[in-house]
Interface confidence: medium
Amino acid sequence: YDFTNCDFQKIEADYLRTISKDLITYMSGTKSTDFNNTVSCSNRPHCLTEIQSLTFNPTPRCASLAKEMFARKTKATLALWCPGYSETQINATQAMKKRRKRKVTTNKCLEQVSQLLGLWRRFIRTLLKQQ
């Protein structure tokens, strides 16, 4: 999906109002120094592409994030403020079911959510720069 035509201001407002709180709740009890941020993004559409990927695509060591509250709110926000987003996601979900390879090892969900927080902060920063 091409996030170029999203209403970035509205997405930022939704993030600051609810999604950020849910992400922080998920991370509560962990220190910001526990994990290094290795994922970055360069502009608003790129940030949203990375956010979508980390939130909804099961990774080898974290498969459950898509059912968390912050993910549900992220999905609703993108569907609301990115034209045509909902339709593209239905096909993507079907295609993904067979494709992924998971690995039974160490749980990395907290690390992944830490990366997500970093991506969202980057999204807000790039938005402020544009303004």
Epitope: M27, A63, K67, K97, T105, N107, C109
Partner: antibody, heavy 117, light 107 residues
């Protein structure tokens, strides 16, 4: 709704094998791992092993390595756990459970396996 | 393997009491801790995961806290249906292991 339905109780002789089935319904079988956990009478819970039904990748508790085989049949949405060389201390309730990241949101009803001569 | 140690192993309480059960991991498991409730003859039921997240349908009187190695399950006001055995379990890395259980009995 999500259901994991296990096969019935078994009585086995020492040295023999038992195969317990776990039929899943109400969700996409290949999207979740199936774990096997056992509980001896009056005791706690013990993780035995796991299977990814999408490709039959397994990981087993070292304690059961060589004695336990976990398989899955995607066409029938059924997972199986076979335990061989049974001894009296294997008498337990065997549970299958569904998981994405190591915690179990749905469990089978349990299968009592009694090992007795 | 990561060892999980629960305390107490049993406790007696009355309806309406606040009950606290603790679980200690032998090494850092961050917030990867789940709590289960089990009644006699039944399969365990998930109460909490990620140390503090309640799945849908679990009453809000149950709460979890802690991270690293020390965790707590709290029942704010014990109800008749809460008399059961409670287990903690880490979901950090294989092999996943459980605490030995805490039996909550009627005083």
């Amino acid at each position: 709704q999500v259901q994991l339905v296990q096969s019935g109780a078994e009585v086995k002789k020492p040295g023999s094998s038992v195969k317990v089935s776990c039929k899943a319904s109400g969700y996409s079988f290949i999207s979740y791992w199936i774990h096997w956990v056992r509980q001896a009478p009056g005791q706690g819970l013990e993780w035995m092993g796991i299977i990814d039904p999408s490709d039959s990748d397994t990981s087993l508790n070292q304690k059961f390595q060589g004695r336990v085989t976990i398989t899955a049949d995607e066409s029938t949405s059924t997972a199986y756990m076979e335990l061989s060389s049974l001894r009296s201390e294997d008498t337990a309730v065997y549970y299958c459970a569904r998981s994405l990241d190591g915690y179990y949101d749905y469990w089978g009803q349990g299968t009592l396996v009694t090992v007795s001569s | 393997d990561i060892q999980m140690t629960q305390s107490p192993s049993s406790l007696s309480a009355s309806v309406g009491d606040r009950v606290t059960i603790t679980c200690r991991a032998s090494e850092n498991i961050y917030s990867y801790l789940a709590w289960y409730q089990q009644k006699p003859g039944k399969a365990p039921k998930l109460l909490i995961y990620n140390a503090r997240t309640l799945p849908e349908g679990v009453p809000s009187r149950f709460s979890g806290s802690g991270s690293g190695t020390d965790f707590t399950l709290t029942i704010s006001s014990l109800q008749p249906e809460d008399f059961a055995t409670y287990y903690c379990q880490h979901h950090y890395t294989t092999p996943w292991t459980f605490g030995q259980g805490t039996k909550v009995e009627i005083k």
